[in-house]
């Protein structure tokens, strides 16, 4: 058993049919010695008396808010949550496996630049009685500070018969050094509590590996005289790190016909313009990637050829 | 050419060669994104590699003030990786394919380090750790880790030279 926060405790349980329960001794936080009684949750029934209450925690029915009282007055509370371990593996019932980029990916994180700011998100089908708390650091043995905000519900989607809820959090490294080569990964830890179930999820990454630039901005076409060619131009997204002479992007320009089956013409360039042939009913798209490190491409920015 | 304590390097040449290094490093080990090598307990293996750190002056401001600190750090790293790529980690079993980009990568690391430090001038270099994995699978894992680390190192070096070529070239 360990303390998650003031008056909230997590009991770690091996979860198999003939597992013994965990013996927990609750102590009433009071100088009083006599006339103390204990109750659980909303029930007014007395579970025991005395300054300590020894319980066996085996089921979610044993978790909950234990309260000690004296003469009708509440003295203190202890909320017990359960953390299940099945076959030596901590349960992951609360969050959905996103399976990208690999199985058992519960947290996904992205950064728009090298400023040390990043966003993580996760999915669940649970709609109520759910709380998240996020902590982060650079490195784990001698951790350096990363400040995370509160996790918020960022999207709701219908997936077949189920509703899926996306939560996200923004974090900022306290003393980020955008130009340095990272040697210690960022660690992100999410505590998830659903009703009386506690779970924790972690992710470890370098900012460089989670970079995904915003799409190029101000995508424009300029027809070239007496030609089917057009000059496509664009700019670096506002959110990308500066100066651009240092934090450079490379670009992919694509000409795509109306039909998905049509052959796509692709051009790669480090410049912010390119000359391409514009076919009727086609569209031109441009995306960006860090020039020197192969992290994710941005989403496409597109304009129609007409 | 970079002369210790003195003139500027050939920024444009360094830019071109460092960008080539980036391409080679990724073609030598393109699928790293699908393998989380940090899970494989790399404390004793790649923690000794020289990293370009915050105080090394490789940021735009630091380069403007005095690029020599940064260039020395990059040079150290290039020599370190050049030695690693020439060691039995890469020459031993399992053998690299004949058309593997590792050979070119090795040569380009040497080329860039020589651009930064011509014959007769010496910056102190870092000792390479004695890593001699006994098993082929250990060697393979170590190669992945070294290449992964090299990708991050040459990315910073390439940014330095690109910025230098754009803003510090005479």
């Amino acid at each position: 058993i360990w303390e998650l926060k003031k008056d909230v405790y997590v009991v770690e349980l091996d979860w198999y049919p003939d597992a013994p329960g965990e013996m927990v001794v609750l102590t009433c936080d009071t100088p009083e010695e006599d006339g103390i009684t204990w109750t659980l949750d909303q029930s007014s029934e007395v579970l025991g008396s005395g300054k300590t209450l020894t319980i066996q925690v085996k089921e979610f029915g044993d978790a909950g808010q234990y309260t000690c009282h004296k003469g009708g007055e509440v003295l203190s509370h202890s909320l017990l949550l359960l953390h299940k371990k099945e076959d030596g593996i901590w349960s992951t019932d609360i969050l959905k496996d996103q399976k990208e980029p690999k199985n058992k990916t519960f947290l996904r994180c992205e950064a728009k630049n090298y400023s040390g700011r990043f966003t993580c998100w996760w999915l669940t089908t649970i709609s109520t009685d759910l709380t998240f708390s996020v902590k982060s650091s650079r490195g784990s043995s001698d951790p350096q500070g990363v400040t995370c905000g509160a996790a918020t519900l960022s999207a709701e989607r219908v997936r077949g018969d189920n509703k899926e809820y996306e939560y996200s959090v923004e974090c900022q490294e306290d003393s980020a050094c955008p130009a340095a080569e990272e040697s210690l990964p960022i660690e992100v830890m999410v505590d998830a509590v659903h009703k009386l179930k506690y779970e924790n999820y972690t992710s470890s990454f370098f900012i460089r590996d989670i970079i995904k630039p915003d799409p190029p901005k101000n995508l424009q076409l300029k027809p070239l005289k007496n030609s089917r060619q057009v000059e496509v131009s664009w700019e670096y997204p506002d959110t990308w790190s500066t100066p651009h002479s240092y934090f450079s992007l490379t670009f992919c320009v694509q000409v795509q016909g109306k039909s998905k089956r049509e052959k796509k013409d692709r051009v790669f360039t480090d410049k912010t313009s390119a000359t391409v042939i514009c076919r009727k009913n086609a569209s031109i798209s441009v995306r960006a990637q860090d020039r020197y490190y192969s992290s994710s491409w941005s989403e496409w920015a597109s304009v129609p050829c007409s | 050419r970079a002369v210790p304590g003195g003139s500027s390097p050939a920024w444009t040449q360094c830019q071109q060669l460092s960008q080539k290094l980036c391409t080679l490093a990724w073609s030598a080990h393109p699928l790293v994104g699908h393998m989380d090598l940090r899970e494989e307990g790399d404390e004793e293996t790649t923690n000794d590699v020289p990293h370009i750190q915050c105080g090394d002056g490789c940021d735009p401001q630091g380069l403007r003030d005095n690029s020599q600190f940064c260039l020395q750090r990059i040079h150290q790293g290039l020599i370190f990786y050049e030695k690693l790529l020439g060691s039995d980690i890469f020459t031993g079993e399992p053998s690299l394919l004949p058309d593997s980009p590792v050979g070119q990568l090795h040569a380009s690391l040497l080329g860039l380090s020589q651009l930064l430090q011509p014959e007769g001038h010496h910056w102190e270099t870092q000792q390479i750790p004695s890593l001699s994995p006994s098993q082929p699978w250990q060697r393979l894992l170590l190669r992945f880790k070294i290449l992964r680390s090299l990708q991050a190192f040459v990315a910073v070096a390439a940014r330095v030279f690109a910025h230098g070529a754009a803003t510090l070239s005479p």
């Epitope: 049919p17 003939d18 597992a19 013994p20 329960g21 013996m23 927990v24 659980l40 949750d41 909303q42 029930s43 029934e45 579970l47 209450l53 020894t54 319980i55 066996q56 925690v57 085996k58 089921e59 979610f60 029915g61 044993d62 909950g64 234990y66 009703k195 | -």
Partner: antibody, heavy 119, light 107 residues
């Protein structure tokens, strides 16, 4: 006052189905799991299993798994034990009981439902 | 499953006697043991839990002791209403199991 009131005695033929009930009152129904115990004529007590009224989480005695089904209706604070195909060997007194949280033993019991299966 | 063995299976005693019933578990169950009293035609009633804690409303003449594998229920001075069958139950490991019962009769 805590009360667990069980449905009346049943006489059934082999192969028939049956559902007996246990209605709880006088306490917070969702705080306490409900269990069932069998007592065959002239015999001792046998633990069938327990169930959470909150989310229908169930722990069956392996000996009874597949033989009986436990269920619960939160809205009426009622627990159920059912058989899809009774056998003569199911003849017994069945007790529902309230599981004490933080312990696991049964602190309050229903009066019992006698089930007789005979052709 | 954990076997619970009670002894004796039955015993005769008189009002005012001190009576001891023992219960042995086939493996360690800590203090997670309860005692119940059952009278003919009635439901069992909880007497003792956690091996030695008395259920609310149970007279003080009933006491429990023991831990691990050996447990005892003691009635310090038998009363006429105490003649019944007594069961021990372990609630440490699923499935929770009962002893076979001890029938306490009037001598």
């Amino acid at each position: 006052e805590v009360q667990l009131v069980q449905s009346g005695a049943e006489v059934k033929k082999p192969g028939e189905s049956l559902k007996i009930s246990c209605q709880s009152s006088g306490y917070s129904f969702t705080t306490y799991w409900i269990g069932w115990v069998r007592q065959m004529p002239g015999q001792g007590l046998e633990w069938i299993g327990i169930m959470s009224p909150v989310d229908s989480d169930i722990r069956y005695n392996p000996m009874f798994r597949g033989q009986v089904t436990m269920s619960v209706d939160k809205s009426s604070s009622t627990a159920y034990l059912q058989w899809s195909s009774l056998k003569a060997s199911d003849t017994a007194m069945y007790y529902c009981a309230r599981r004490r949280p933080g312990q696991g033993y049964f602190d309050f019991w229903g009066q019992g439902t006698m089930v007789t299966v005979s052709s | 499953d954990i076997q619970m063995t009670q002894s004796p299976s039955s015993l005769s005693a008189s009002v005012g006697d001190r009576v001891t019933i023992t219960c042995k578990a086939s493996q360690n169950v800590g203090s997670w043991l309860a005692w119940y009293q059952q009278k003919p035609g009635k439901a069992p009633k909880s007497l003792i839990y956690s091996a030695s804690s008395r259920q609310s409303g149970v007279p003080s003449r009933f006491s429990g002791s023991g831990s691990g594998t050996d447990f005892t229920l003691t009635i310090s001075s038998l009363q006429p209403e105490d003649f019944a069958t007594y069961y021990c139950q372990q609630y440490d490991i699923y499935p929770f199991t009962f002893g076979q019962g001890t029938k306490l009769e009037i001598k």
